[in-house]
Interface confidence: low
């Protein structure tokens, strides 16, 4: 019989108290082969950081500063269970900090030296660690004492509970530094009124204070808010314009053999029984004997973690940088205006060999990073271990989500001004043999089908998503016999055709064979009936255009389209017999790499793009055997976006709201991570 | 593989200068990119810019403005054009090949050409 | 990125060891390669630079292997084992780790 108890950490007799009602009470409603309480007393938040990891206790409630240390090695533990505030609608399980500024001021993020700054107090997250933590590297040297950088760096400060004596500059805007209610510019409301005031320039507070303090709009308008990118926005796009996202209040639990499915049952039970206003007798959101014991006594319920997020994931790519760089107090040397190299995300062993490969003829200004599928890459971009890769528009979608933004588009035809004119999109086509004259749009069920990838546009996202509107559910698998659509689960139907060997079978990546367009192409060739590509597939495989023996000696003239209508059409005229039109591969990154990308890959084309005529003693940025590696073959150049700039702009409505419905079959893991930090 | 410069041996302050280095044994289109040096008076070293193989150029940042790079396969040379010189361009200028891997070290120079700007 | 040659000159009798060095400002050493993006140039009395050394440390076809080149990170050193008369020439390094590539000043070897 598994063991279903799951060992809660307690840091004071309180909390212990606590626990034992917690454990009493839940054995009074949970049958006896639910889960159980038992509670272990450890001296800190820390001591119980390294229980857990040593497996003498399972689950503790932390801070988000704490989440960092619990992900740090050795511990390796990751959020499970998150505390939501609000309502159930609309629950709330983080916060923004931001940087909240007068209208009329007129300087950006990067202009705040020499600025009054407002702090909420010294050492707490919305008002010191995060941004002085994201400042950090801009401190001047050296930085430590922190609170004298600081001092040197803004020309007055109000930072509430800093040592006045030492660092008289950190209380010139609140004489003294008192750190309580009683210094007029403590704290979130504090630190605005600072602003309001005049005595500061900037007040780093958390998203709702400025609402909490003007309930007016016409009052929150005076103010705007500092965007890490240097721009500014209105106050109520915070999520769009802040300095960290930060997790309330978070369980958490070994990353390995942590219990997770066993806290969640336990938790969502407990807030069943003794949620808010669900008990008398005890209450899970309450501390009669002092203060947040166990969990926020703010906290409303609490929601699953999704299993993909881990905890850098889960306190974002800001926040981490900054409370790592103030832990670690590291930074590049002396900063240039030069870009730094940009780390290339490929996908298995042919897009390393290839982007090695780019990486020496870059010179340095193009490194490898590796990962084995196309969600492991967005992560690493979200992380920042890696900087950019160009994707195909399902995944433009997922990376969107997560927060990641288009910098430029492949661009498929030739035109004198190929850069500056970013195309409309490709055709997302069905192609059948000529010799399976029967087969038509309106009779694919039991059908043998080829993708490109699960979630890619073309080869999924297009297809399946007309396919779900008309058989209303979610069961592919069952409606073709069998086929290969890499990134599906192992068992099943549509991995059968998959022709990759071992752990590569079905894997979305060029380890599987029919992975990408041509791998689609291949499958309908050697075992399908149906392969979901795009419309220039055909005609760069056929006519011995690609000289791989599968594919030498085809002829275009053996293959056809799938109409809408029910009718079937050569393969040239794709135009007037296609699924949709898809929007071209783009490259993505994240918001601060945005520049440097750019105008990195515009060197990189310039040197290696489409004018290079002979790629077999040079290196091809948009070559590699029709194998798509890096940028799909075709590629002429990447092109600006101009004003298509965001993940919805570029994907257009229309594809976003398809993409939207076929969510409800979404087997994305990161992307249910995503939509969890930003619904 | 041989490279030979050739141009004015004078040229005014604020004139233009244009150079150009021949390539014989190896066509520019093949392969490799195909750069411009200079050697100040004092010795001093400096990369100017090259022509790819395939058309592209890159230049020195310091010099981007009034630089230019160019071609003609037919011929097999490659051109470098310098606007509103000043006495500081005075200099013995090399054309260079690269040796691709490794990228930028130039296995392959010309004599060099010395040009003088001076009224 | 700056290279400072030193010494700026020396005098050896033929058959001495010389070594001089040439110390980057920033890394040549390339993580992803592993590969330290370093040139060795002689020019000798009135004519053009001769690539000596590639890679921080591999001879040039027809180099004579009297000359080494060692060092990783921000140090080099191209080392001539033995001198002889024909080695008088100034010795420049290059790196070619960013744009734009970049010589040191160089360092000029002369016969006692």
């Known amino acids: 019989v598994p063991d279903k108890t799951v060992r809660w950490c307690a840091v004071s007799e309180h909390e212990a108290t606590k626990c034992q009602s917690f454990r009493d009470h839940m054995k009074s409603v949970i049958p006896s082969d639910g889960p159980s309480v038992a509670c272990v007393k450890k001296a800190s938040y820390l001591d119980c950081i390294r229980a857990i990891a040593a497996n003498e206790a399972d689950a503790v409630t932390l801070d988000a500063g704490l989440v960092y240390d619990a992900y740090l090695a050795p511990n390796n533990l990751k959020p499970v269970v998150a505390e939501f505030y609000g309502s159930k609608e609309d629950p709330q399980t983080f916060y923004y900090a931001v940087a909240v500024v007068k209208k009329d001021s007129g300087f950006q993020m990067n202009q705040l030296r020499g600025k009054k700054s407002c702090h909420t107090g010294l050492g707490r997250s919305a008002g010191w660690n995060i941004p002085i933590g994201l400042l950090y590297c801009d401190l001047p040297e050296p930085r430590k004492p922190l609170e004298k950088a600081v001092a040197n760096f803004f020309s007055g400060s109000c930072a509430p509970c800093a040592d006045g004596t030492d660092f008289p500059q950190l209380c010139q805007l609140c004489p003294g530094c008192g750190c309580s209610t009683l210094n007029q510019y403590f704290g979130y409301s504090g630190a605005f009124k600072c602003l309001k005031d005049g005595a500061g320039d900037v007040a780093f507070v958390k998203h709702s204070t400025i609402f909490e303090n003007l309930a007016n709009k016409a009052d929150r308008d005076q103010y705007e808010l500092l965007c890490l990118d240097n721009t500014r926005k209105p106050v109520d796009e915070y999520k769009d314009c802040h300095l960290a996202q930060v997790p309330s209040h978070t369980v958490v639990a070994r990353s390995m053999g942590g219990k997770e499915d066993l806290i969640w049952e336990l938790l969502n039970q407990a807030q069943e029984h003794f949620g808010k206003d669900k008990s008398k007798e005890f209450q899970l959101f309450s501390s009669p004997h002092g203060k947040d014991l166990l969990f926020k006594d703010s906290a409303h319920g609490f929601l699953k973690v999704p299993p993909r997020m881990d905890a850098k994931m889960y306190l974002g790519y800001e926040y981490v940088t900054a409370i790592r760089n103030l832990r670690e107090g590291t930074c590049p040397e002396a900063p240039t205006d030069e870009c730094k190299p940009v780390k290339w995300c490929a996908l298995s062993h042919h897009e390393r060999l290839k982007c090695d490969e780019w990486s020496v003829n870059s010179v340095g200004k193009i490194e490898c990073v590796s990962a084995e599928t196309t969600e492991d890459c967005i992560a690493k971009i979200m992380n920042g271990e890696a900087d950019a890769m160009s994707l195909d528009g399902g995944f433009v979608y997922i990376a969107g989500k997560c927060g990641l933004v288009p910098v430029l588009a492949e661009n498929y035809n030739k035109s004198d001004n190929c850069e500056d004119t970013p195309e409309a999109g490709y055709f997302a086509i069905a192609v059948v043999k000529k010799s399976a004259s029967d087969l038509t749009w309106d009779n694919l069920k039991g059908k043998k089908s080829c993708h490109t990838a699960v979630g890619r546009t073309a080869g999924w996202n297009i297809p399946m998503g007309l396919l779900y509107n008309k058989i209303n559910h979610c069961r592919f698998d069952e409606f073709f016999s069998e086929g290969c659509a890499p990134g599906s689960k192992k068992d099943s139907s549509l991995c059968k055709l998959c022709m990759g060997s071992g752990l590569n079978l079905c894997e979305p990546n060029n380890k599987e064979g029919y992975y990408g367009y041509t791998g689609a192409f291949r499958c309908l060739v050697e075992k399908g009936d149906v392969a979901f590509v795009k419309h220039q597939t055909v005609p760069q495989n056929t006519g011995g255009k690609n000289p791989d023996p599968w594919a030498k000696n085809l002829n275009e003239k053996d293959y056809e389209l799938l109409c809408l209508d029910g009718t079937r059409k050569p393969v040239e005229e794709y135009a007037n017999c296609h699924l949709a039109r898809a929007p071209n591969h783009a490259v993505v990154t994240r918001k601060d790499k945005e520049a440097c990308v750019h105008k990195i890959l515009r060197q990189q084309q310039h040197l290696f793009g489409s004018n290079v005529t002979d790629c077999s003693g040079n290196f091809c940025l948009f070559r590699s055997e029709t194998k798509d590696l890096l940028f799909r073959d075709d590629t002429v150049c990447l092109a600006k976006l101009h004003d298509r700039n965001t993940y919805e702009k570029y994907l257009g409505e229309e594809y976003v709201k398809a993409v939207g419905n076929l969510r409800k079959c979404s087997t994305s893991s990161l992307l249910e991570a995503c939509t969890f930090r930003r619904p | 593989v041989q490279l030979q410069e050739s141009g004015p041996d004078l040229v005014k302050p604020s004139q233009s200068l244009s150079l150009t280095c021949t390539v014989t044994g190896y066509s520019i289109t093949s392969g490799y990119s195909w750069h411009w040096i200079r050697q100040f008076p004092e010795n001093k070293l400096e990369w100017l810019g090259y022509i790819h193989s395939s058309g592209a150029t890159n230049y020195s940042p310091s010099l981007k403005s009034r630089f230019s790079i160019t071609r003609d396969t037919s011929k097999n040379q490659f051109f470098l054009q310098l606007n509103s010189v000043t006495t500081e361009d005075t200099a013995t200028y090399y054309c260079a090949r690269d040796g691709y891997s490794p990228p930028y070290a130039m296995d392959y120079w010309g004599q060099g050409t010395t040009v003088t700007v001076s009224s | 990125i700056e290279l400072t040659q030193s010494p700026s000159s020396l005098a050896v009798s033929v058959g001495e060891k010389v070594t001089m060095t040439c110390k980057s400002s920033q890394s040549l050493l390339y993580s992803t390669n592993q590969k330290n993006y370093l040139a060795w140039y002689q020019q000798k009395p009135g004519q053009s630079p001769k690539l000596l050394i590639y890679w921080a440390s591999t001879r040039e076809s027809g180099v004579p292997d009297r000359f080494t080149g060692s060092g990783s990170g921000t140090d080099f050193t191209l080392t001539i084992s033995s001198v002889k008369a024909e080695d008088l020439s100034v010795y420049y390094c290059?790196?070619?780790?960013?744009?734009?590539?970049?010589f040191g000043s160089g360092t000029k070897l002369e016969i006692k």
């Open positions: 290059q790196q070619y780790y960013s744009y734009p590539p970049t």
